[in-house]
Amino acid sequence: MAVTACQGLGFVVSLIGIAGIIAATCMDQWSTQDLYNNPVTAVFNYQGLWRSCVRESSGFTECRGYFTLLGLPAMLQAVRALMIVGIVLGAIGLLVSIFALKCIRIGSMEDSAKANMTLTSGIMFIVSGLCAIAGVSVFANMLVTNFWMSTANMYTGMGGMVQTVQTRYTFGAALFVGWVAGGLTLIGGVMMCIACRGLAPEETNYKAVSYHASGHSVAYKPGGFKASTGFGSNTKNKKIYDGGARTEDEVQSYPSKHDYV
């Protein structure tokens, strides 16, 4: 039950995280004009990964896309790449984890397969979250660097006499959305990996115990190994003894006196 809950919660947390990563990637407010100790401009500038926008005091907002690919800073391209990789991995992870969910039955999929899928999706979520956090952090670092550079030179001289306003940018809402979303995806991935441990069939499976507690009839397999004991490699026969959902106690069961004739 706890495994199912952990897996389900991991899936939901990752889903929210990936939705957040997508939202952050699409948001225009990655960097916003710093209004503190700056010349008071009648317009408000903010920038995203894909376009820059200007909001005039009337509320009129105009956005212009970055229509060049080669002319963009390498760092911005790197951030775009990290965010896209994060989204793609997260989306694949979600798809995989849907089929891995214990509460969803798909044909005769074994628990081992579900465990593997849960682990795969968990790893994907972790990498996805890390990509998002890395992308946002790289952008934030770029902002901090540019901020102090423009603070050192608030106005850049042009021809000695003419001055041009140096717009300083600070952290936009998208950065915080990205950090939180990346963190959630990462946490969701870890939860999926933890759930995988509970789903994975152990080397010694004592689930058959409850079926043989009342009687002492022993079924022999070719080669002299007792099928009922669960010793040996019995994963192929596992479904025969699977009575349904296990509790935590069942996973931890130990041999009883009834296991031996």
Epitope: T41, Y46, C53, E56, S58, V165
Partner: antibody, heavy 119, light 113 residues
Amino acid sequence: EVQLVESGGGLVQPGGSLRLSCAVSGFTFSSFGMHWVRQAPGKGLEWVAYISSGTTNIYYADSVKGRFTVSRDNAKNSLYLQMNSLRAEDTAVYYCVRSGYYGQSLDYWGQGTLVTVSS
Amino acid sequence: DIVMTQSPDSLAVSLGERVTMNCKSSQSLFNSGNQRNYLTWYQQKPGQPPKLLIYWASTRESGVPDRFSGSGSGTDFTLTISSVQAEDVAVYYCQNVYIYPLTFGQGTKLEIK
């Protein structure tokens, strides 16, 4: 039709106070920022103050800062300019102006009200 | 504060003639975010309040005759009247609408010869 009608102008002694009003009609007043611009007799235009639609942003010209206060009452479709510590150089025609939707332009102007500061 | 300087102070032209007047700002009025220049031109006829002609340095306000055109970027701007009409007699002002306090040029007076 957009209309801006200023009132409250007149003769006042130096150091005195005056409150100008601007009654607005023909557009959704609460959606637009508003400016006060003045023009001394025979002189050019001088921007005085700006108030945003929701009164979040208020800016003044250095020459009036600390003496003039701009305010608005969106429910009454009215703009105000409270002028204190008036000086002779404040003598001018005061225009109430709407801030345009595009390009920060000042698109609609009232006819103006004359303020004379003299002893 | 941004200082706006207009030239010439006045000019007299014949009807139908092409006229240009200049406006120079002490700081750039160009906003890189939307690639626009925040400069506005106004026309003030005698005894009337000013009228908006051009915003964003080159965009004509609706209802303004197409003989009026604006150009320039950064710090240097020009208002051109391609063929002067009698009703164009007025004082023309440029205004910085980019940085507060907003500032006007001293004006250029247009007269007919």
